[in-house]
């Protein structure tokens, strides 16, 4: 949070996570000012000379932008007057992780706030029944994770059971040599039960559920960013 008081305005940021290779947003809001031409937004990154992005006098000024951010950043220009200084970041890289500062100056005053940006890879798991196995098994796959996550299985019927002895998890490096595909197989499953495959690293936690009955298979998956 920025410092409130005379000549200072409140600036608020939120810790967030970026998914490598996807587009991300660094969130920052401030006390609105209807005088767009008097608003200056500067995004800085700790350890980087030059700016990540600058918006002033109602338009971008990228003359001081660091090379690593060239062609990758934009503010939501039409939302600046309502106090949105968030930064759109294209093609998130592992090296984009770090501490960013959102600095704001308006006719009301100035303020700044820091933001911790974590980068990694996370994706939804998909669980399928593996009919090829000698005994009925479940196969949980998630295409992109980094850093290497932990994988755990749970079941509604056998709550608290440890499935590590009856499951096998593998990690396959993807073509860009950073992220990995996660595959986990759970053996000896029983019908009329709901199984969950949980994948987690320090950035995200994803869960895939599957309910197998005689007549149907129901699936559900969800993904939650941690510490965001």
């Amino acid at each position: 949070f920025g410092i409130s008081g005379k000549h200072f305005i409140t600036v608020t940021t939120f810790t967030s996570a970026g998914n490598i290779g996807e587009d991300g947003t660094l969130s920052c809001t401030f006390e609105p000012d209807i005088k767009l031409n008097g608003i200056v937004i500067q995004w800085l990154k700790e350890g980087i000379k030059g700016l990540v992005h600058e918006f002033k006098e109602g338009k971008d000024d990228l003359s001081q932008q660091h090379e690593m951010f060239r062609g990758r950043t934009a503010v939501f220009a039409d939302q600046v007057v309502v106090g949105n200084a968030s930064l759109r970041l294209k093609n998130v890289q592992l090296t984009d992780a770090g501490t960013y500062t959102c600095y704001i100056r308006t006719s009301k005053g100035k303020g700044n706030a820091n933001l911790e940006y974590k980068t990694g890879a996370f994706s939804m798991p998909e669980i399928n029944v593996d009919y090829n196995a000698s005994s009925e098994s479940l196969r949980c796959e998630a295409p992109r994770w980094f850093p290497q996550p932990t994988v755990a299985w749970a079941s509604q019927v056998d709550q608290g059971a440890n499935f590590s002895e009856v499951s096998n998890t593998s990690f396959e490096l993807n073509s860009e040599n950073v992220t990995m595909k996660v595959v986990s197989v759970l053996y000896n499953v029983t019908i009329n039960n709901t199984y969950s495959c949980m994948i987690e690293n320090d950035i995200a936690k994803a869960t895939g559920d599957i309910k197998v009955t005689d007549s149907e298979v129901k699936r559900r998956s969800q993904l939650q960013l941690l510490n965001s």
Partner: antibody, heavy 120, light 107 residues
Framework: QLQLQESGPGLVKPSETLSLTCTVS??????????WGWIRQPPGKGLEWIGN???????YYNPSLKSRVTMSVDTSKNQFSLKLSSVTAADTAVYYC????????????WGQGTLVTVSS | EIVMTQSPATLSVSPGERATLSCRAS??????LAWYQQKPGQAPRLLIY???ARVTGIPARFSGSGSGTEFTLTISSLQSEDFAVYYC?????????FGGGTKVEIK
Amino acid sequence: QLQLQESGPGLVKPSETLSLTCTVSGGSIKSGSHYWGWIRQPPGKGLEWIGNIYYSGSTYYNPSLKSRVTMSVDTSKNQFSLKLSSVTAADTAVYYCAREGSYPNWFDPWGQGTLVTVSS
Amino acid sequence: EIVMTQSPATLSVSPGERATLSCRASQSVSTNLAWYQQKPGQAPRLLIYDASARVTGIPARFSGSGSGTEFTLTISSLQSEDFAVYYCQQYHSFPFTFGGGTKVEIK
């Protein structure tokens, strides 16, 4: 509205340097949210991005052409320029200048293009 | 660099019919993709950016969709002025690259 116009010699000899200038009218080259780019199209073929320049003079070139490309800008004349050295017949193309979004990085509008033939 | 592949190379369509053009990226480009129209002797014209955002002034019959590696440009009902070559362009990472183009011709 914003218009771009390429100018320069239509014929260049092999091993020499191709030089083109793009004049921007109807708007300022100092537009903060835009780069200024060059794209080329060999006869009957597809499009190749050559590189871009910001009004402050910072540049980014296509690695495949980087060793031969130089771009510059003259804000007082509202112009930016392309130089391509050591040309061969493979550099024969229609050369376009265009305004490039800083992000999203679309090209719009484009100049009408100028054909440069490399031949002795 | 990211290689963009367009298919088909040529598409023969009757006026009033729907045209579906495909563009595939060699790796994910998220939604960082633009579509252009080029007529003979003219410069390309921007139609779509961010995979699906139509440029102001471009008719609603043009629509873009897709994300990741698979993209589509759809022209819902072809007009005579729509017969041209269409290019996709990725701006996900440098160097920006274009597809080889799809020529939409009168059937």
